[in-house]
Amino acid sequence: EEELQVIQPEKSVSVAAGDSATLNCTVTSLIPVGPIQWFRGAGPGRELIYHQKEGHFPRVTSVSESTKRNNMDFSIHISNITPADAGTYYCVKFRKGSPDVEVKSGAGTELSVRAKPSAPVVSGPAVRATAEHTVSFTCESHGFSPRDITLKWFKNGNELSDFQTNVDPAGKSVSYSIRSTARVVLTRRDVHSQVICEVAHVTLQGDPLRGTANLSEAIRVPPFLEVTQQSMRADNQVNVTCQVTKFYPQRLQLTWLENGNVSRTEMASALPENKDGTYNWTSWLLVNVSAHRDDVKLTCQVEHDGQPAVNKSFSVKVSAHPKEQGSNTAAENTGTNERDYKDDDDKHHHHHH
């Protein structure tokens, strides 16, 4: 009789995760009698995948009926493939004995598992930065195979070039992870901007996965301050206005100081949004000049988003206003937020990130 050969016709087989894999193996002779075993890997550490004679292999079935007369087909079917199943599989013929003795191995079939990358997760900086500063965004995706993968960054649809990408591990693995860090220069107009991380992989059939981050989470647009005196009101009252404009985020505290003493503190809330995503706020103070002998120094102090306070001062000239007899107190009205509400919905409008 001819010498037995173990034939594994496919050098490699590629399967999508979740699918089934068929690993083919035929022998050329019924001699010697003995079982076929399938192993993943070679050498002493090889892992038994299927044993024709004994054992329980719930995910593995023989393709042909092993009890069939003259059976020389020992192909197997592995169900519900995962990336952990990747490797080289060997069909090995044994001679019956106590124990069975290995006779010949097939050349091996490499099983590669095509696994989709996880949805990219984009994370931004831990602290906000202001315009003209560079911030870093990180994109991560895991669990894909094969290793080849393409990652691109976009800001508002425009592709970015300043990024660094790593795929790990560098060597052979059942699955891989990608991590990319992009550097983005902020502008004052970026409150509504978005960065997108786009991952393309063979398993995605040309339909890349995207992860996004809003620059509104990363940016701080400091306010402009302007203090002005409105036209003289009756009863020797001067209306001083503090306009706080173009700031983001909304978290802002405004304090009025009269000659260095706290007069009133207000917190910004439920402000309408500008088109560019920033906010404006106006606060005013009514000063009764007849209650003051000297000029009054008014200071509008703004603390924005936990940053050091910004001051803007304005002097009210008392000498320019005649005093009213018997009055020795300053009359102040509480300033209110300058709002132009169109309807109740606007009143409760919040900026969405």
Partner: antibody, heavy 119, light 110 residues
């Protein structure tokens, strides 16, 4: 290692039935045929039938086709051979044997069950 | 059905001598490039034991003094140097069709 453990000796009256069991261990029961062979006292070997436990496919010796029935219980890895309408010349040792190579041969044997048919 | 006829029915051979047992089939047992003949040894009070499969292949653990040969319809089991423990009845079996056994050959020491 492969083991086939058979049920104990039986004494039956003519016309009765006997059911011999064969419990397999040391291998995957459904992957190999089980044969049944008998041997009358001082006589040669006589093949009765074979069964594939994976799907209960059977082949019978024409001599026994109408009287013998082979079954298996895969949950307990046990094969059974029932012989009906017993006659005195059915007195024999009944062997189960496993076919390791699907060559319709008998690689591993049980120790046998003596069935005595006597009035 | 294929009928197997063994010869001789019994045989006495001296220790260390060659023993030869023949098995003739009523028609060819060759198929698919194989000769579907098997040889068994049965000692008193024991079940048979497979010695040779597919005419010429020794089963696991069988001493190499046992050999099988032949093709088509004529087959031979040879024990090259008889040992005391070889005393037994020897059966041939075919499986080109459904299994059948020869009538057996009793081997004794002369």
């Amino acid at each position: 290692q492969v083991q086939l453990v058979q049920s104990g000796a039986e004494v039956k009256k003519p016309g009765a039935s006997v059911k011999v069991s064969c419990k397999a261990s040391g291998y995957t029961f459904t992957n190999y045929w089980i044969n049944w062979v008998r041997q009358a006292p001082g006589q040669g070997l006589e093949w009765i039938a074979m069964i594939d436990p994976s799907d209960s496919e059977t082949h019978y010796n024409q001599i026994f086709k109408d009287r013998a029935t082979l079954t298996t219980d895969t949950s307990t890895s046990t094969a059974y051979m029932e012989l009906r309408s017993l006659r005195s010349d059915d007195t024999a040792v009944y062997y189960c044997a496993m076919d390791y190579g699907s060559l319709y041969a008998m690689d591993y044997w049980g120790r046998g069950t003596l069935v005595t048919v006597s009035s | 059905d294929i009928v197997l006829t063994q010869s001789p029915d019994s045989l006495a051979v001296s220790l260390g001598e060659r023993a030869t047992i023949n098995c003739r089939a009523s028609k060819s047992v060759s198929s698919s490039g194989y000769n579907w003949i098997f040889w068994y040894q049965q000692k008193p009070g024991q079940p048979p034991k497979l010695l040779i499969y597919l005419a010429s292949n020794r089963d696991s653990g069988v001493p190499d003094r046992f050999s099988g040969s032949g093709s088509g319809t004529d087959f031979t089991l040879t024990i090259s140097s008889l040992q005391a423990e070889d005393v037994a009845v020897y059966y041939c079996q075919e499986s080109r069709e459904l299994p059948t056994f020869g009538q057996g050959t009793k081997l004794e020491i002369k």
